[in-house]
């Protein structure tokens, strides 16, 4: 069973709840309040605030926090005020500001480019496999299989537009019905939300920042998962999306439009096409069972080709195989017919790094994956640093107020809907929900945008990406127009339905609460973030995929007990938090379960063993590099080795020091801190040599 957040020793308090966890308490835990008891006893203990049933985290032995971890941090301006500066100072300050803006835009540019290359890398590594997922014939009859294929393919190619376009071409070619395509589109919607979750992982260095960033990213995931959880069964039962979109497509006489404007691609393409260019048709061809495509490389070699349509004479087994009776003849021995063939002549090679290497797709993909993640991480760190230095004092106050403040009463409710429109508009401009939500993630992390405000922006982003798809569908050729438009509209109405489910009534904004809960767990146990990513985007879909291949009996046989257990646990938690007296004493808390089933602590100890060992090596390497760097530039203060390395050493010597957050996952000392032995510190460690 999956590891649970700490649930032991918790006394329900329905009036008040604590969504906090670890990381930035200003004071050390009060040891006097703790009772000396083992995990298995049911003796009365200190009351702590318990999260209501909808949350995913309630932690053991946590003191009540003075500060709400979800409150936005105050970014203090330590600099000299503008009015106190002399002319020279003002000019210098102005040019510094301009420089920072240029740097910010530069890093933002490379951040977006690295996302594009990351997508290409994923396509090179898993694109062909993704294409083969589509060639599974069971998709037609099994909506659940369609859903997980949509998730897996989009995760593998890091692009919902790629997976959607494959679906469109399959529907156009009658290899797939619109009915079978809808679950795949739902899955693609889920899959696309992995990108900003990966981006959030890059902010693992600072607990409070990571808490916000990860929650801000996963709010997208939870919205998509919850929407599918409700809307897929509804669609299977009623086919409402199929019916509505069919009526729309049939009632309008659409003429082929123009392509959706590529606004951001215009700027990023000149750079990204120098790195790598892909022939994305290969994935579609594999999906459509084209055997020849399986041996083709995704790396584009020839960019300028001349396509000549010509008629060639070909031999056929018999006259029955002729294209038409009048185009049939014999040479006396063999039957011949005339066939239209497209002859492709290569004229000019592409201008990108990998054009002459002739490396296998996997190798190119792996290289690009590593490089793009490094650039992504570097850019994100720099963006956060620049924003951190810019967004201080008055500037931060103005921006935060502008973004996070609601309209005056009675129009406060409209603010969220405006945010949805802004999110949709911005996504339409950048032509990618991944880019928009990924850019939003660090802003949530550093505390410029609240999760409550990021949520409607993300929902808007979901709508924005579908409007782009609708425009792209209108630009499709005649035969693909109907199917591509209907699928784009299915995507649109699915997101609209999701918004109607999880946004209008504040009480139903479950994704926010779930994301915050996950943010709390991940801030305390940072390895859990990676665990979550692997489980939700790979293991669960792959398991469902495997079970579906085994047959629906196996899927039901395994799925029904799992779903039953989940429902049982949720009901039990609901009763524990709302009306515990209804339950027998034993079921009023989770102490009847072994510790590993109700707490992440034992799991943390296991993970810490692995990461601790890895971290030791990493820190040694860091120190050697740092010292070499200092020797080279002949300056002992030019760079510092990672503070976390020093902490690691000190902690191992048994010294009681504040633990700084490392860039990698939690180490031994952090698991100690989780147990309350070491006070947590909120100061940010820069694990990069600056």
């Amino acid at each position: 069973m999956a590891p649970w957040p700490e649930l032991g020793d918790a006394q329900p308090n329905p009036d008040k709840y604590l969504e906090g966890a670890a990381g930035q308490q200003p004071t050390a835990p009060d040891k006097s309040k703790e009772t000396n008891k083992t995990d298995n006893t049911e003796a009365p203990v200190t009351k702590i605030e318990l999260l209501p049933s909808y949350s995913t985290a309630t932690l053991i032995d946590e003191p009540t926090e003075v500060d709400d971890p979800w409150n936005l941090p105050t970014l203090q301006d330590s600099g000299i005020k503008w009015s106190e500066r002399d002319t020279k100072g003002k000019i210098l300050c102005f040019f510094q500001g301009i420089g920072r803006l240029i740097l910010l835009l530069g890093f933002l540019y490379f951040f977006v480019c690295s996302l594009d290359i990351l997508s290409s890398a994923f396509q090179l590594v898993g694109g062909k496999m993704a294409g083969q997922f589509f060639s599974n014939s069971s998709i037609m009859s099994n909506p659940l299989l369609g859903l997980v294929i949509g998730v897996l393919v989009t995760v593998l190619v890091q692009s919902s537009s790629t997976s959607t376009s494959i679906v469109v071409s399959m529907v156009s070619s009658s290899l797939l019905t619109v009915r079978a395509a809808i679950p795949i589109i739902m899955g693609a919607n889920i899959g696309t939300s992995i990108t900003n979750t990966i981006v959030a992982l890059m902010q693992v260095g600072d607990r409070s920042e990571f808490r916000r960033a990860f929650a801000g990213a996963t709010v997208h995931d939870f919205f998509n998962w919850l929407s599918v959880l409700v809307l897929l069964p509804v669609e299977v039962a009623t086919h409402y999306l199929e019916i509505i979109t069919q009526l729309i497509v049939e009632s309008f006489h659409f003429k082929n439009g123009e392509d959706a404007p590529d606004l951001l691609k215009v700027i990023t393409k000149p750079f990204t096409k120098l790195i790598v260019q892909l022939d994305k048709k290969v994935i579609s061809q594999i999906a459509m069972n084209d055997e020849k495509a399986k041996n083709k490389s995704l790396v584009k070699i020839w960019c300028k080709t001349f396509t000549n349509k010509t008629q060639i004479n070909v031999t056929v087994p018999s006259t029955a195989n002729c294209t038409s009776p009048s185009l049939c003849w014999t040479d006396g021995i063999q039957n011949w017919t005339m066939k239209n063939v497209t002859y492709k002549e290569n004229i000019a090679k592409c201008q990108h790094i990998f054009v002459n290497f002739h490396l296998p797709d996997l190798a190119v993909g792996t290289i690009l994956l590593i490089l793009s993640l490094l650039v992504l991480c570097g850019c994100l760190i720099m963006i956060v640093k620049i924003l951190g230095s810019v967004l201080k004092g008055q500037v931060a106050t103005v921006i935060k107020k502008t973004i996070n403040t609601d309209f005056p009463f009675p129009f406060a409710w409209l603010t969220g809907y405006l945010a949805i429109l802004v999110g949709a508009g911005m996504t339409f401009i950048v032509q990618s929900s991944s880019v928009f939500t990924s850019a939003l993630t660090p802003l949530i992390g550093i505390g410029v945008i609240t999760i409550e405000r990021a949520y409607p922006l993300t929902l808007g982003s979901n709508i924005g990406t579908t409007t782009t798809a609708i425009l792209a569908a209108l630009a499709s050729p005649g035969n693909a127009l109907r199917s591509s438009l209907q699928i784009a509209l299915c995507h649109f109405f699915f997101n609209i339905s999701g918004i109607l489910l999880w946004y209008p009534i504040p009480f139903t904004r479950l994704p926010i609460r779930m994301a915050k809960g996950l943010g709390n767990i991940s801030a305390k146990y940072r390895w859990f973030a990676v665990f979550y990513l692997i489980i939700f985007f790979f293991l669960i879909p792959l398991t469902v995929f495997g079970l579906s291949l085994a047959g629906w009996r196996v899927l039901v046989g395994v799925g029904v007990p799992v779903v039953f257990i989940i429902i049982l646990v949720l009901c039990l938690r609901l009763l524990q938090s709302r009306c515990p007296r209804v339950l027998p004493k034993k079921l009023q808390n989770w102490n009847f379960l072994p510790l590993w089933m109700r707490s992440l602590k034992p799991w943390d100890a296991v993970v810490s063993k692995f990461t601790g060992c890895f971290q030791m090596r990493c820190c040694c390497c860091c120190r050697v590099c740092c010292r070499a760097c200092c020797l080279l530039c002949d300056c002992p203060k030019c760079c510092r080795c990672s503070k976390c390395c020093e902490d690691l050493e000190e902690a191992q010597e048994g010294q009681d020091v504040p633990v700084k957050a490392p860039e990698t996952f939690d180490n031994i000392t952090i698991s100690r801190e989780a147990q309350g032995e070491v006070p947590a510190s909120d100061s940010k460690t820069e694990c990069t040599a600056l």
Partner: antibody
Framework: QVQLQQPGAELVKPGASVKMSCKTS????????MHWVKQTPGQGLEWIGA????????AYNQKFKGKATLTADKSSSTAYMQLSSLTSEASAVYYC????????????WGQGTSVIVSS | DIVMTQSHKFMSRSVGDRVRITCKAS??????VAWYQQKPGQSPKLLIY???TRHSGVPDRFTGSGSGTDFIFTISNVQSEDLADYFC?????????FGAGTKLELK
Amino acid sequence: QVQLQQPGAELVKPGASVKMSCKTSGYTFTTNNMHWVKQTPGQGLEWIGAIYPGNGATAYNQKFKGKATLTADKSSSTAYMQLSSLTSEASAVYYCARGMYGHGAMDYWGQGTSVIVSS
Amino acid sequence: DIVMTQSHKFMSRSVGDRVRITCKASQDVGTAVAWYQQKPGQSPKLLIYWATTRHSGVPDRFTGSGSGTDFIFTISNVQSEDLADYFCQQYSSNPLTFGAGTKLELK
């Protein structure tokens, strides 16, 4: 230039068989079909069959199946037709003709072999 | 078998005249038709293939037309050396079949 050389005449007795040759030059023997055509004053031109010297594949007019056998010798670039169990009706001029690649038109013809079946 | 019918056994023309020789197929043969010229005591010589395409070295006064079942072979400006038998042949399907031939004579 393309040339197809055939012996001028063959005199055979009824019931016997004859093997006539068609020696080619001026092109790659194995790339084109070799057709055999019978011409009689009464019947006009009749297609007997064809052979593809490249792989030895043959096709026959149903009327001549069992009567004619087509073979080819790649080493000497020569095509052969054997006619068996000859009767007086087999008396005719037999042409070998090169087939154009990819269709059944015959672009170069031999001079023809006149077969006379007489006791 | 496909039967190729040449309606005229003999045609008489003067030098400089235009002559049209017709050929009718018993079923659709598309454009898989060839025309041959055979002078007395010689072997046939290919003039036209694919119903309209002139073979290399063939003077442009020889033209072919038609598709399906009806084909026409035209000599636009008859010369004395054109006196010969003209055969049509189909190669739409096996067995390949020839027309009975049309003998062009000088008036």
